[in-house]
């Protein structure tokens, strides 16, 4: 058993049929010694008396809010949550496996630049009685500070018969050094509580591996005289690290016909303009990637040819 | 050229070669996710690689003030990786074909280090840890770790030379 926060405790249980469970001793936070009784949740049934209460925690029915009273007055509470371990593996019932980039990916994170700011998100089908708390650091043995905000519900989607809820959190490294080569990964830890079930999820990454620039901005076409060619130009996204002579991007320019089956013409360039042939009903798209490190491409910025 | 006396390197040449190094490093080990190398548990193997750290003066401001500290750090790293890529880690099994980008990577690391430090000038270099894994799986794991780490190192070096070529070239 360990303390998650004040008056909230997590009991770690090996979860299998007829498991013996864990013996837990609760102590009433009071100077009083006599006349103390214990109850669980809203029930008025007295579970025991005395300053301490010993219970055998085996299942969710044994978890909940234990309260000690004296003469009708509440003295203190202890909330017990359960953390299940099945076949040596901690349960992951609350969050959905996003399976990208690999199986058992519950948390996904992205950064728009090298400033040390990043966003993580996760998915669940649970809509109520759900709380999250997020902590992060750079490195684990001698951790350096990363400050995370509160997790918020950022999207709701219908998937077949189910509703899916996306939560996200923003974090910022306290003393980021955008130009340095990272040697210690960022660690992100999410505590999830659903009713009386506790689970924790972690992710470990370098900012360089989660970089995904915003799409190029101000995408414009300039027709070239007496030609089917156009000059496409664009700018670095505002959110990208500066100076651009140091934090450089590379770009992919694509000409795509109306039909998805039509052949795509692609050009790669380090410049912020390119000359392409504009076909009727086609569109021109541009996306960006770090020039020197192959992290994710941005989403496409697009304009129609006509 | 970045000689200890403090004259400038051939920024544009260094820029071109460092960008080529980036491309080669990703050709040699393109996969980001097929093995989470940090989960593999033998941390000591690549902990000794030289990293370009915050105080090394490789940020735009540090380069403007005095690029020598940064260039020395880059040179140190290039020599370190060049030695690793020429070692038994990359010559033993699993077999690399003669067309492997590792061969070109090895030659380009040497080329860039020579651009930074012509014959007759000496910056101190970092000791290479004596790693001689006997099993193919240990060797392959080390290769992947070294190449992932090299990708990060050459990315910073390429940024330095790109910025230098754009802002510090005479």
């Amino acid at each position: 058993i360990w303390e998650l926060k004040k008056d909230v405790y997590v009991v770690e249980l090996d979860w299998y049929p007829d498991a013996p469970g864990e013996m837990v001793v609760l102590t009433c936070d009071t100077p009083e010694e006599d006349g103390i009784t214990w109850t669980l949740d809203q029930s008025s049934e007295v579970l025991g008396s005395g300053k301490t209460l010993t219970i055998q925690v085996k299942e969710f029915g044994d978890a909940g809010q234990y309260t000690c009273h004296k003469g009708g007055e509440v003295l203190s509470h202890s909330l017990l949550l359960l953390h299940k371990k099945e076949d040596g593996i901690w349960s992951t019932d609350i969050l959905k496996d996003q399976k990208e980039p690999k199986n058992k990916t519950f948390l996904r994170c992205e950064a728009k630049n090298y400033s040390g700011r990043f966003t993580c998100w996760w998915l669940t089908t649970i809509s109520t009685d759900l709380t999250f708390s997020v902590k992060s650091s750079r490195g684990s043995s001698d951790p350096q500070g990363v400050t995370c905000g509160a997790a918020t519900l950022s999207a709701e989607r219908v998937r077949g018969d189910n509703k899916e809820y996306e939560y996200s959190v923003e974090c910022q490294e306290d003393s980021a050094c955008p130009a340095a080569e990272e040697s210690l990964p960022i660690e992100v830890m999410v505590d999830a509580v659903h009713k009386l079930k506790y689970e924790n999820y972690t992710s470990s990454f370098f900012i360089r591996d989660i970089i995904k620039p915003d799409p190029p901005k101000n995408l414009q076409l300039k027709p070239l005289k007496n030609s089917r060619q156009v000059e496409v130009s664009w700018e670095y996204p505002d959110t990208w690290s500066t100076p651009h002579s140091y934090f450089s991007l590379t770009f992919c320019v694509q000409v795509q016909g109306k039909s998805k089956r039509e052949k795509k013409d692609r050009v790669f360039t380090d410049k912020t303009s390119a000359t392409v042939i504009c076909r009727k009903n086609a569109s021109i798209s541009v996306r960006a990637q770090d020039r020197y490190y192959s992290s994710s491409w941005s989403e496409w910025a697009s304009v129609p040819c006509s | 050229r970045a000689v200890p006396g403090g004259s400038s390197p051939a920024w544009t040449q260094c820029q071109q070669l460092s960008q080529k190094l980036c491309t080669l490093a990703w050709s040699a080990h393109p996969l980001v996710g097929h093995m989470d190398l940090r989960e593999e548990g033998d941390e000591e193997t690549t902990n000794d690689v030289p990293h370009i750290q915050c105080g090394d003066g490789c940020d735009p401001q540090g380069l403007r003030d005095n690029s020598q500290f940064c260039l020395q750090r880059i040179h140190q790293g290039l020599i370190f990786y060049e030695k690793l890529l020429g070692s038994d880690i990359f010559t033993g099994e699993p077999s690399l074909l003669p067309d492997s980008p590792v061969g070109q990577l090895h030659a380009s690391l040497l080329g860039l280090s020579q651009l930074l430090q012509p014959e007759g000038h000496h910056w101190e270099t970092q000791q290479i840890p004596s790693l001689s894994p006997s099993q193919p799986w240990q060797r392959l794991l080390l290769r992947f770790k070294i190449l992932r780490s090299l990708q990060a190192f050459v990315a910073v070096a390429a940024r330095v030379f790109a910025h230098g070529a754009a802002t510090l070239s005479p």
Epitope: - | E93, L97, D99, Q135, P136, L140
Partner: antibody, heavy 120, light 107 residues
Framework: QVQLVQSGAEVKKPGSSVKVSCKAS????????IHWMRQAPGQGLEWIGY????????RYNENFKGKVTITADKSTSTAYMELSSLRSEDTAVYYC?????????????WGQGTLVTVSS | DIQMTQSPSSLSASVGDRVTITCKAS??????VAWYQQKPGKVPKLLIY???TRHTGVPSRFSGSGSRTDFTLTISSLQPEDVADYFC?????????FGSGTKLEIK
């Protein structure tokens, strides 16, 4: 896109020789090794060897040394595999293939195969 | 030479079944193993490399696992178009060698 086009089927007498060609296109011929494999009827694959056109250096499976000669013609982007002193057990489909760009020998692109039949 | 012992040599399964093919290397090959599919009269097609990485365009029902000497190719839900021969291949050590193949049929 990368393509490997092999020469047509051959029927040969025991003791004779055969030269199979593999014309490459869609990439820089001198950049990558070209490998040869064979597959006897109803059998698995056997790796014969490769040529690196950049420096014309071949490498052979010891089991095929003296039996096989692999060459390359940079001017036509074509690799050749010559089999000598043919015997009935050399009857097989012969494939050329090129590996992944990372320098390890898993094979992404294959020729369509050339059936060599050795029969008296 | 490294022997790649592949089993079973043939198997028959129903559509939707989970199918497993194994390959045992005679010595450590790290994860330098690829798997190929060869349909009758066709050229071998790369499915998996580095023991577990799916090649571009290969359906997610195909997965690979293993390291050092023991390797597995799994088809999570067999489809009619999966009827073919399957070969493992080690590229750790010269001469590169292949398993003898598994002929997969639909019941």
């Amino acid at each position: 896109q990368v393509q490997l086009v092999q020469s047509g089927a051959e029927v040969k007498k025991p003791g004779s020789s055969v030269k199979v060609s593999c014309k490459a296109s869609g990439y820089t011929f001198t950049d990558q090794t070209i490998h040869w494999m064979r597959q006897a009827p109803g059998q698995g694959l056997e790796w014969i060897g490769y040529i690196y056109p950049r420096d014309d250096s071949p490498r052979y499976n010891e089991n095929f040394k003296g039996k096989v000669t692999i060459t390359a013609d940079k001017s036509t982007s074509t690799a050749y595999m010559e089999l000598s002193s043919l015997r009935s057990e050399d009857t097989a489909v012969y494939y050329c293939a090129i590996p992944d760009r990372s320098g390890y020998a898993w094979f992404i692109y294959w020729g369509q195969g050339t059936l060599v039949t050795v029969s008296s | 030479d490294i022997q790649m012992t592949q089993s079973p040599s043939s198997l028959s399964a129903s559509v939707g079944d989970r199918v497993t093919i194994t390959c045992k290397a005679s010595r450590d090959v790290a994860i330098a193993v690829a798997w190929y599919q060869q349909k009758p009269g066709k050229v071998p097609k790369l499915l998996i490399y580095w023991a577990s990485t799916r090649h571009t365009g290969v359906p997610s029902r195909f997965s690979g696992s293993g390291s050092r000497t023991d390797f597995t190719l799994t088809i999570s839900s067999l489809q009619p178009e999966d009827v073919a021969d399957y070969f493992c291949h080690q590229y750790s050590s010269y001469p590169f060698t292949f398993g003898s193949g598994t002929k997969l049929e639909i019941k």
